[in-house]
């Protein structure tokens, strides 16, 4: 028989983690493995048909994606949709596929809304999702005794698909669910310095534990301004939500592992400011299969797609598409063995959910709602050399924090700052006021 996989991803623009130039080679590698393994879909041929989720400008589109999906549905009647990755493109496609009762498999669509499976039935996320970041942060807060207040700042950049809005939304909602905690959130425009000034005025009244989603440059600017304003001392901690670790990469940008460094005359101050910073990224898989997969992926991307893949965490997305597709094919194989058909979307999907799988990204667990358990890394500065290193990983499956470094985190005080100031944000603690009065008497 024939099994058709309908792909709805950016076909021209290579900048997205889920661009076809990146995911295509991963799909090829997965299908080559299916052919090579007699236990997977014996006697079946798997073919891919392509539709673009981008508009004429190469930008993800909530119009182009569903139109492409509809065309693919009526023309090819696919058994499964692969993608989209962009939130606004995936939303309408996911609603259509739910209505058609056709499984949708993606390693993108990380926003909180896709976890609502009555709306996005049969949507399986084999990649990371933002609510899972909230699980990590909640675990971190519990261990550090931060159970009262946090502040989340997110940058707005025109044309960036509101990545930071969705990231902070997932984080905010999950942290509030997991902990009885007050969380404030503020948006700022990356290109408007007056916004930064306003944030710095608000910060002291709103939080000591601060999460920031922004570009590496915006985060550095904020840290420099915070240092200038005296907010980078021992009382504050700033977490940069840099999930793909852009700030930790070399190349054109900052030196590897030195996100404060630019060679612009402000490095000394920036290094000092970054003493109060930690960085949260996805965890880089460290299993040998992943390294081998990356070698093959890069080779194939160059040979067949004329695309040079850079190193970095962004490659976990094509790898997750690869693993997700293999998991789907495993589920189809089992469904057929039990007398089902490739069009039995519900049955196939149920076999993918609440399931573990050993893939190129390592041990992969899809939870009971069809979302992958996600691993994260916490990076911290080594005060000796100013380089950031992974000090802690979060295992999404076991929901445990794993000590990676043998050395403790770099807290200026030697211990984590409290999440609310000693006397409260507005000096409202009566004990502090009492002390103050007694000195006046």
């Amino acid at each position: 028989g024939n099994l058709t996989v309908a792909v709805v991803l950016p076909l021209a623009n290579t900048s997205y983690p889920w661009s076809w130039a990146r995911v295509g080679p991963a799909v090829e590698l997965a299908l080559a493995q299916v052919k090579a393994r007699p236990d997977l879909l014996p006697g079946w041929t798997v073919r891919t048909v392509l539709g673009s989720s981008e508009n004429a400008l190469g930008v993800c589109s909530d119009t182009a994606a569903p139109l492409a999906a509809v065309d693919l549905k009526w023309e090819h009647n696919p058994a499964v949709f692969l993608g989209p990755g962009c939130v606004y493109a995936a939303a309408p496609v996911g609603r259509f596929t739910a209505h058609w009762r056709v499984p949708l498999l993606t390693a993108g669509a990380p926003a909180l809304g896709f976890g609502v499976k009555d709306e996005y039935a049969l949507t399986t996320r084999a990649g990371p999702s933002y609510a899972k970041l909230g699980d990590f942060v909640a675990a971190l807060h519990r261990r550090l005794g931060w159970e009262r207040q946090a502040l989340m700042l997110y940058a707005y950049r025109p044309g960036d698909e509101e990545h930071c809005f969705f990231l902070v939304e997932g984080l905010f909602m999950r942290v509030r669910d997991r902990l009885n905690i007050t969380v404030d959130h503020l948006e700022f425009a990356e290109d408007d310095l007056s916004h930064y000034t306003r944030l710095l005025r608000t910060m002291p009244r709103k939080g000591r534990v601060i999460y920031i989603c922004s570009s590496p440059d915006a985060f550095r600017t904020l840290m420099l301004l915070a240092l200038e304003a005296g907010l980078c001392g021992e009382d504050y901690v700033f977490f940069h939500l840099d999930i793909f670790g852009q700030s930790l990469q070399g190349g054109q940008g900052p030196a590897p592992r030195r996100p404060w460094e630019r060679g612009d005359g402000q490095d000394v101050s920036a290094r000092q400011a970054f003493q109060a910073a930690k960085i949260i990224t996805y965890k880089d898989p460290d299993n040998p299969e992943y390294l081998e997969f990356l070698k093959q992926l890069k080779h194939l991307a160059y040979e067949q797609f004329n695309f040079t893949m850079e190193d970095g965490l962004v490659n976990t997305i094509p790898a997750s598409f690869h693993d997700g597709l293999l998991l789907y094919i495993q589920a189809v194989t089992e469904t057929l063995a039990h007398g089902g058909t490739v069009t039995d979307g519900e049955n196939i999907t149920q076999r993918m959910w609440n399931r573990s799988f050993q893939g190129v990204t390592g041990y992969l667990k899809i939870d009971s709602s069809g979302d992958r358990e996600t691993d994260f890394s916490l990076w911290d500065m080594d005060p000796e050399n100013g380089a950031f290193r992974v000090v802690l990983n979060y295992n999404g499956t076991s929901q445990e924090l794993v000590a990676v470094s043998g050395r403790k985190l770099n807290w200026p005080l030697g211990y984590p700052p409290p999440d609310i100031p000693k006397c409260g944000f507005d000096n409202e603690d009566p004990a502090c006021n009492q002390d103050h009065l007694s000195t006046l008497e």
């Epitope: 005794g145 794993v402 000590a403 990676v404 470094s405 043998g406 050395r407 403790k408 807290w411 005080l413």
Partner: antibody, heavy 120, light 107 residues
Framework: EVQLVESGGGLVQPGGSLRLSCAAS????????MGWVRQAPGKGLEWVSS????????YYADPVKGRFTISRDNSKNTLYLQMNSLRAEDTAAYYC?????????????WGQGTLVTVSS | AIQMTQSPSSLSASVGDRVTITCRSS??????FGWYQQKPGKAPKLLIY???RLQSGVPSRFSGSGSGTDFTLTINNLQPEDFATYYC?????????FGPGTKVDIK
């Protein structure tokens, strides 16, 4: 309640080997750096070795480097110390300790100790 | 390796006294430093971490101060259960090193 229980100590001849174990319970084992601290009879405390929760980082004191190997089995919540080429000066009570890299609590939990005697 | 020196090596005091023990490191260790109490036949117990933070459950008569190379443990209103040996420890860098200890006994 946190518990650390050491075992495996005993009398061994110089040049011999011994493997100490520490069974941990009452906390998230992988979240902590674990280590060994020893104390020779009537003497002070000496840090011996530490290992990270991910098993990727191990550290040793100079006197034991190349002779002792620290390891852990996170699935069994157990810490080990393989001691080879033992010398008389390794005679001591060996304590299993926790080190919380997140909060900065250094060696806040200790086992009751297991005595290693190296003598002919 | 960083050397830790402790003084005095022993002292005699009475119940109710104020006792001060000092520890000096051979190089700057910020506040990556702790104090331990050990009683005969028992495992040591953490009193102070990060140079001045009182470990949970430790009486407030114990206090720590210092940063860099010089550190102090102070016991106010010495109690009978405080007669023990006290050790300092640096966890600034591996290898971690303890001080030689200070024995506090009854005058």
């Amino acid at each position: 309640e946190v518990q650390l229980v050491e075992s495996g100590g005993g009398l061994v001849q110089p040049g011999g080997s011994l493997r100490l174990s520490c069974a941990a319970s009452g906390f998230s084992f992988v979240s902590y750096v674990m280590g060994w601290v020893r104390q020779a009879p009537g003497k002070g405390l000496e840090w011996v070795s530490s290992i990270s929760g991910s098993l990727t980082n191990t550290y040793y004191a100079d006197p034991v480097k190349g002779r002792f190997t620290i390891s852990r089995d996170n699935s069994k919540n157990t810490l080990y110390l393989q001691m080879n080429s033992l010398r008389a000066e390794d005679t001591a009570a060996y304590y299993c300790v926790t080190y919380d890299i997140l909060t900065g609590h250094l060696f806040d939990y200790w086992g009751q100790g297991t005595l290693v005697t190296v003598s002919s | 390796a960083i050397q830790m020196t402790q003084s005095p090596s022993s002292l005699s005091a009475s119940v109710g006294d104020r006792v001060t023990i000092t520890c000096r490191s051979s190089q700057g260790i910020r506040n990556d430093f702790g104090w331990y109490q050990q009683k005969p036949g028992k495992a040591p117990k953490l009193l102070i971490y990060a140079a001045s933070r009182l470990q949970s459950g430790v009486p407030s008569r114990f206090s720590g101060s210092g940063s860099g190379t010089d550190f102090t443990l102070t016991i106010n209103n010495l109690q009978p259960e405080d007669f023990a040996t006290y050790y300092c420890l640096q966890d600034y860098t591996y290898p971690f090193t303890f001080g030689p200890g200070t024995k506090v006994d009854i005058k």
